[in-house]
Interface confidence: low
């Protein structure tokens, strides 16, 4: 049998696990689609991203709202040919997520 | 130009972007590789794993240390011939994290 | 309050090699992003930048000197250490460490270097 | 390396009347990000020089507005609206688009 303490602590995990923006690590430049001879430092910065589980296999968690934050950075050009400069960066930051049914496909793709 | 206290923000944003054990919700199913008439509720746990970005293309943000922590789930089998059960479910949780160079690859892989 | 000072030896001999240390405090060389430098000036004359180093140890060299000079820095003093060898007459100057932003914002008061025999 | 090319060498001023500095680059100093990295600095005597215009026109902190700068690709000038006795020193021009990092020669404006 099971008591109602160990279905707390279940049902809190699965809270925890489910589809909402979550704190994730973005790489700048695949995020831009900058061109080779650019790159950032830091290549990374912290956004919120949709993540975590849905209950259906049909369903995915996506985003439903996005703001875009400003990320200040250093945009190096290679090779180096001046100071690194700070330049203000927008990304994409999820700011609501919902459990929603994948794109239908096409039946011959 | 830029001032140190510019720098320091980005300075902390880059320590926590870097590659270290992560909070993530992965799915117990596809983890253990069950047969696709077991299930488990919640279909998905929250433990540790490697993320983050490294310093360079060429490494990648692999595990050094894994522990097996244990999760009560319940575990259904279809068609339902009895009632739900719980089980402990071992899973992986990165403890120790590293950049890692990545396998090196066949030149006609 | 950021400053930053120069230090080393007022005299050296020709074919010489010259060390010279920055300290600095009011930021740390371990900060994302951070660098420091060196500029001269001869007596009366242009500045002129040599080299710099930067949080993650990538270092930068004026071409015309770089087989000159070496850069290096010591992160838990506070300090970066400039060599310059083979030194000539001609390299009579005072020596500016700088904190690297663009553009230089911070200097040191400059120490003078005279080179002779 | 980019020379870069300051006239006057010297410049007496009056006390009140304005100056005017010119620099000159031997190549254009917009870099591929479309900024200009044109500086200017002010060196008193027996002084560090210190930062007066950074990119071309925008004023560092604390500078008084009588400093001006202007210009875009190899020519740039600096400007005192109405000079005053503590303005004397050797203005210099620096580029940081190209390395080396480079600079002018320097103009020493004095009170007549």
């Known amino acids: 049998f099971y008591d109602i303490e160990t279905l707390k602590v279940i049902d809190e995990e699965w809270q925890r696990t489910q589809c909402s923006p979550r704190e994730t690590c973005v790489e700048v430049a695949s995020e831009l689609g900058k061109s080779t001879n650019t790159f950032f430092k830091p290549p990374c910065v912290n956004v919120f991203r949709c993540g975590g589980c849905c209950n259906e296999e049909s369903l995915i968690c996506m985003n439903t709202s996005t703001s875009y934050i400003s990320k200040q950075l250093f945009e190096i050009s290679v090779p180096l040919t001046s100071v690194p400069e700070l330049v203000p960066v927008k990304v994409a930051n999820h700011t609501g997520c919902k459990c929603l049914p994948t794109a239908p496909r096409h039946p011959y793709s | 130009f830029y001032d140190i206290e510019t720098l320091k923000v980005i300075d902390e944003e880059w320590q926590r972007t870097q590659c270290s054990p992560r909070e993530t919700c992965v799915e117990v199913a596809s983890e253990l590789g069950k047969s696709t008439n077991t299930f488990f509720k919640p279909p998905c746990v929250n433990v540790f794993r490697c993320g983050g970005c490294c310093n360079e293309e060429s490494l990648i943000c692999m595990n050094t240390s894994t522990s097996y922590i244990s999760k009560q789930l319940f575990e259904i089998s279809v068609p339902l011939t009895s009632v739900p059960e719980l089980v402990p479910v071992k899973v992986a949780n990165h403890t120790g994290c590293k950049c890692l160079p990545t396998a090196p690859r066949h030149p006609y892989s | 309050q950021v400053t930053l000072k120069e230090s080393g030896p007022a005299l050296v001999k020709p074919t010489q090699t010259l060390t010279l240390t920055c300290t600095f405090s009011?930021?740390?060389?371990?900060?994302?992003?951070?660098?420091v430098g060196w500029i001269r000036q001869p007596p009366g004359k242009a500045l002129e930048w040599l080299a710099n180093?930067?949080?993650?140890?990538?270092?930068y060299y004026n071409p015309v000197l770089q087989d000159r000079l070496t850069i290096s820095k010591d992160t838990s003093k506070n300090q970066v250490v400039l060599t310059m060898t083979n030194m000539d007459p001609v390299d009579t100057a005072t020596y500016y460490c700088v904190q690297v932003t663009n553009p230089f914002v911070f200097w040191g008061q400059g120490t003078l270097v005279t080179v002779s025999s | 390396d980019i020379v870069m090319t300051q006239t006057p060498l010297s410049l007496p001023v009056t006390p009140g009347e304005p100056a005017s500095i010119s620099c000159r680059s031997s190549q254009s100093l917009v870099h591929i990000n479309g900024n200009t990295y044109l500086h200017w600095y002010l060196q008193k005597p027996g002084q560090s020089p210190q930062l007066l215009i950074y990119?071309?026109?925008n004023r560092f902190s604390g500078v008084p507005d009588r400093f001006s700068g202007s210009g875009s690709g190899t020519d740039f000038t600096l400007k005192i609206s109405r000079v005053e006795a503590e303005d004397v020193g050797v203005y210099f021009c620096s580029q940081s688009t190209h390395v080396p990092w480079t600079f002018g020669g320097g103009t020493k404006v004095e009170i007549k």
């Open positions: 009011g930021f740390s060389l371990s900060t994302y992003g951070m660098g």
């Open positions: 180093i930067w949080w993650n140890d990538d270092k």
């Open positions: 990119k071309v026109s």
